[in-house]
Interface confidence: medium
Amino acid sequence: FKVATPYSLYVCPEGQNVTLTCRLLGPVDKGHDVTFYKTWYRSSRGEVQTCSERRPIRNLTFQDLHLHHGGHQAANTSHDLAQRHGLESASDHHGNFSITMRNLTLLDSGLYCCLVVEIRHHHSEHRVHGAMELQVQTGKDAPSNCVVYPSSSQDSENITAA
């Protein structure tokens, strides 16, 4: 399977909400011993491997934000913890999954990574991730609403399995 990032850059005004999206592509193993986790975390640019460093999103780790199910299934984080931080992650039946961040501040700017992890019983992880940048702007140059910039076809298929 692969992860596609429809948009590589989101430019948003301070105070706005934004939904970052990724899509799980390709066949997924629906075996009884296979679990899929979809989650999100922050990272930083300038690494040898994008998304290799993991940092929390608004103090919530990838474990706090993960969706846990068996493949192309719908799920969402309803737990209070995420919502108290203005976050919600969700997933639909078509492989799309997202994180919504409410009331953006300048501190939310940075690199965000979506991640799909396949785990077989008693075995290690097959990871695939996608990366996108969020720029939160303030002042007269800020857009009135979020503007999204599509990934190039190469970027949207830029799959890093780890």
Partner: antibody
Amino acid sequence: EVQLVQSGAEVKKPGESLKISCKGSGYSFTSYWIGWVRQMPGKGLEWMGIIYPGDSDTRYSPSFQGQVTISADKSISTAYLQWSSLKASDTAMYYCARDDALYGGYYLDYWGQGTLVTVSS
Amino acid sequence: DIVMTQSPDSLAVSLGERATINCKSSQSVLYSSNNKNYLAWYQQKPGQPPKLLIYWASTRESGVPDRFSGSGSGTDFTLTISSLQAEDVAVYYCQQYYSTPLTFGQGTKVEIK
């Protein structure tokens, strides 16, 4: 710079309890697992178990289950390895290491300097 | 548990010569979903903690000299030091992370001849 700093060497008597520590810095402590590895004198490396400090999810090697307790305090970015009743055979160097796993058990990319535990009557 | 067996137990090589260490796993550590081998190599110098050299059987960790290389797939793996330097004197361990508990080989001691 990622660093794991372990507590100092310990000399104990059989039957005593002990808790050694491993403090992480230079990275998001709650976003990575911490593993513990034993190295007995002149021997190889043995994986004891791991903990995810974000929620204290813990996995043990069957060889060490019930023999030690792994814990963490995320507020001070510190993981612990403890014994309730030491034996002479616990004499070893104990290393903590950052585990790159997301959901449990991977390669160990940064290591502490080690804590030497000596148990002798 | 997956048993990791290294050979030889010790190895004496002249400076500038090639050193080869083998590691065999009791079952395959190749994950079919991503065609990756869940195997790492570590170097432990005397009096120091281990240091990660290679993961995914052949990916060098950042900062590791390119004279170190890893190869192999499935159950048979090799760590090669293409031109041994004095600072490479150490014990080398392979480790599988295909399944828990994680397991290490018994180690191979590399010395200067």
